[in-house]
């Protein structure tokens, strides 16, 4: 990964665009730390493995997080 060894944060730009939970391969929530001062949300899409940074403050993204955690709680026994 070109910048990973030298940068603290992962996201260059962030997106407000809602993501269909069905098209998600993975959703990573990286908490703020000494390496990066802000929460970062990285969505990995099933199509082509595209990774997209999402805006943690966006209403649509907050709804997505709720939907994903609901889905997870349904699956876990």
């Amino acid at each position: 990964v070109p910048l990973s060894r030298t940068v603290r944060c992962t996201c260059i730009s962030i997106s407000n665009q809602p993501v269909n939970p069905r098209s998600l391969e993975k959703l990573e929530i990286i908490p703020a730390s000494q390496f990066c001062p802000r929460v970062e949300i990285i969505a990995t899409m099933k199509k082509k493995g595209e990774k997209r940074c999402l805006n943690p403050e966006s209403k649509a993204i907050k709804n997505l997080l709720k939907a994903v955690s609901k889905e997870r709680s349904k699956r876990s026994p």
């Epitope: 070109p2 992962t10 260059i12 730009s13 962030i14 990285i42 082509k48 493995g49 997209r52």
Partner: antibody
Framework: QVQLVESGGGVVQPGRSLRLSCTAS????????MHWVRQAPGKGLEWVAV????????YYADSVKGRFTISRDNSKNTLYLEMNSLRAEDTAIYYC?????????????????WGQGTTVTVSS | EIVLTQSPGTLSLSPGERATLSCRAS???????LAWYQQKPGQAPRLLIY???SRATGIPDRFSGSGSGTDFTLTISRLEPEDFAVYYC??????????FGPGTKVDIK
Amino acid sequence: QVQLVESGGGVVQPGRSLRLSCTASGFTFSQYGMHWVRQAPGKGLEWVAVISYGGDIKYYADSVKGRFTISRDNSKNTLYLEMNSLRAEDTAIYYCAREGEGSNIYYYYGMDVWGQGTTVTVSS
Amino acid sequence: EIVLTQSPGTLSLSPGERATLSCRASQSVSSSYLAWYQQKPGQAPRLLIYGASSRATGIPDRFSGSGSGTDFTLTISRLEPEDFAVYYCQQYGSSPIFTFGPGTKVDIK
């Protein structure tokens, strides 16, 4: 509409300084990484610098490292390029460009919006 | 440092013909990091393709990108009069972080 407008170019002597500005409108500037790219007369494109949406990530081309500084003021929707110790080879059109939505260090969405450029001429 | 080479330097074609532009990297480049741009005289560049094969918003489907590793291709299936321009490939990688190829000029035969 989505727009980037550069300003601050002009004729300057070698060794002097200049500050370029790029004013954004029509989109939420504070959510996008921004670049400076230049093009010398009759030549191809040369990337100069990038800054992330929050200003945490800043990278420079080797040709300008230590002389140029990229910065942004999200409250003013403005990107800057501070250029010091200017050389004749810095003569070019300077474009500001927006990094694609959601771009990150793992996936590059390209530079999807460009300004029309501002001309910098370094000459004695 | 990864160097991008574009060929041919100039491509002379007629409207309606197919254009195939090549971009070769000196080392392997992830397709996640490869983009193509179009630039017309006196204008700013315009993003055509990102991720080696994904069309940017508003780009007609006659433009397509393909390739992986060190060899990438931009194809224009049927040239329209407005497609005559210079095309640049670009990669995002280690220092210098973003690199453009030297460009391919597509001109009218």
